[in-house]
Interface confidence: medium
């Protein structure tokens, strides 16, 4: 279902682009799931505009979103997680545009955390470890992680490593000696669920030792 309102308040509705995008987060707050939607055009006048989701819900036919500044948001246990839901932009009872979306295909994981780097002098390598809340979840458990690191002076020269575990080893010889590095990590669903990259974890900074310098554990800066 889609169409444009024709009442006086929205006589210019046909000129507006109501394209929107959404992402879901499953078990983001205990057993509660969330769904966040926003208009792709930041200049859309969102006064009087509401979002509604119908179908593939438990116990209810439809749910209304809460408006939080420029985004629209639902936190609920009522997502069925099988089948497509109809998400509509509405003004009053009139639907301006709708999308059929399977919430399991627009999952955005929570950002990884507790990123750290430890230098192993004997092995001449760096052990990168991080944590993710998804290890404890019932649904989105399997993730692909993207670890990105760069020498701090190289503004946009990131090296990326994809891995499914939460531990990575970087060989010392692949890094510049006596240099400051920035490292960060993000995650994306990798089994059954599909979707988007999480936000990046907070960056961790570490310094590589001088050649032949035994500095032990890398301290955060």
């Amino acid at each position: 279902e889609s169409g444009y309102a024709q009442n006086g308040d929205l006589e210019d509705a046909e000129l507006d682009d109501y394209s929107f995008s959404c992402y879901s987060q499953l078990e983001v707050n205990g057993s509660q799931h969330s769904l966040t939607c926003a208009f792709e055009d930041p200049d859309v006048n969102i006064t009087n505009l509401e979002f509604e989701i119908c179908g593939a819900l438990v116990e209810v036919k439809c749910l209304n979103f809460r408006k939080l500044q420029e985004i629209y948001f639902i936190e609920t246990k009522k997502f069925l997680l099988i089948g497509k839901s109809n998400i509509c932009v509405k003004v009053g009872e009139k639907s301006l545009t709708c999308k059929k979306i399977d919430l399991t295909t627009i999952v955005k994981p929570e950002a990884p955390f507790d990123l750290s780097v430890v230098y192993r002098e004997g092995a001449n390598d760096f052990v990168v470890t991080f944590n993710t809340s998804h290890l404890q979840k019932k649904y989105v458990k399997v993730l692909m992680h993207d670890v990105a690191y760069r020498q701090e002076k190289d503004e946009n020269k990131w090296t990326h490593v994809n891995l499914s575990s939460t531990k990575l080893t970087l060989l010392q010889r692949k890094l510049q000696p006596a240099a400051m590095y920035e490292i960060k990590v993000r995650s994306i669903p990798d089994h059954y669920f599909k979707g988007f990259w999480s936000e990046w974890s907070p960056s961790y900074y570490f310094r590589t030792p001088e050649i032949n310098n035994s500095s032990g554990e890398m301290d955060p800066i």
């Epitope: 119908c54 179908g55 036919k61 099988i82 089948g83 649904y139």
Partner: antibody, heavy 121, light 109 residues
Framework: EVQLVESGGGLVQPGRSLRLSCAAS????????MHWVRQAPGKGLEWVSG????????GYADSVKGRFTIFRDNAKNSLYLQMNSLRAEDTALYYC??????????????WGQGTTVTVSS | AIQLTQSPSSLSASVGDRVTITCRAS??????LAWYQQKPGKAPKLLIY???SLESGVPSRFSGSGSGTDFTLTISSLQPEDFATYYC???????????FGQGTRLEIK
């Protein structure tokens, strides 16, 4: 008109294989999960298997797990059930059914007329 | 897996009678329950979903109620065409799984 038409049933010996097909029409096939439900002669309904719209969610009854495979071809509006290592207890009328989760819960709102599978030596 | 137990397994009633069939779940399923009617030689037909919502085209003499573990299907005034077998059904969304009750056969007295 929304319609489901099953085919592929027949008489088969124990241990052999059979593939059932279900042709769907009158609705947007790739918006819906689909199911196979069977009914042995004089018995009740038994859910066999289900598959989500994009084939990423699949479930089987314990009685068929490891022997039956459900799959679908959205381009052909078709649902299939590959049945291997058939047993006498698989003898039943096999229905294809469309889900209608938009009603709030998983419900099977459209059923085919069924295709009969007889497993006997 | 959740089990559904229907009672009675069969019952005899007369046209005009009020009939109640119950379905008990082995654990709470909120209102995730549907009811179907099946006549001999025919495919099942959806009657009730969400425990109490009447499917389009189904006569209003059919009604459903209940939540949690105990559910009922009521036919307020039996008509000749209502003599059939009735099944309750629930689902699990992850992994995908559906369960039917064993059925209740409603016969003419």
């Amino acid at each position: 008109e929304v319609q489901l038409v099953e085919s592929g049933g027949g008489l088969v010996q124990p241990g052999r294989s059979l593939r059932l097909s279900c042709a769907a029409s009158g609705f947007t096939f790739d918006d819906h999960a689909m199911h196979w439900v069977r009914q042995a002669p004089g018995k009740g309904l038994e859910w066999v298997s289900g598959i989500s719209w994009n084939s990423r969610g699949i479930g089987y009854a314990d009685s068929v797990k490891g022997r039956f495979t459900i799959f679908r071809d959205n381009a052909k509006n078709s649902l299939y059930l590959q049945m291997n290592s058939l047993r006498a207890e698989d003898t039943a009328l096999y229905y294809c059914a469309k889900d209608e989760y938009s009603r709030g819960y998983y419900v099977l709102d459209v059923w085919g007329q069924g295709t009969t599978v007889t497993v006997s030596s | 897996a959740i089990q559904l137990t229907q009672s009675p397994s069969s019952l005899s009633a007369s046209v005009g009678d009020r009939v109640t069939i119950t379905c008990r779940a082995s654990q709470g399923i909120s209102s995730a329950l549907a009811w179907y009617q099946q006549k001999p030689g025919k495919a099942p037909k959806l009657l009730i979903y969400d425990a109490s919502s009447l499917e389009s085209g189904v006569p209003s003499r059919f009604s459903g109620s209940g939540s949690g573990t105990d559910f009922t299907l009521t036919i307020s005034s039996l008509q000749p065409e209502d003599f059939a077998t009735y099944y309750c059904q629930q689902f699990n969304s992850y992994p995908l799984w559906i369960t039917f009750g064993q059925g209740t056969r409603l016969e003419i007295k």
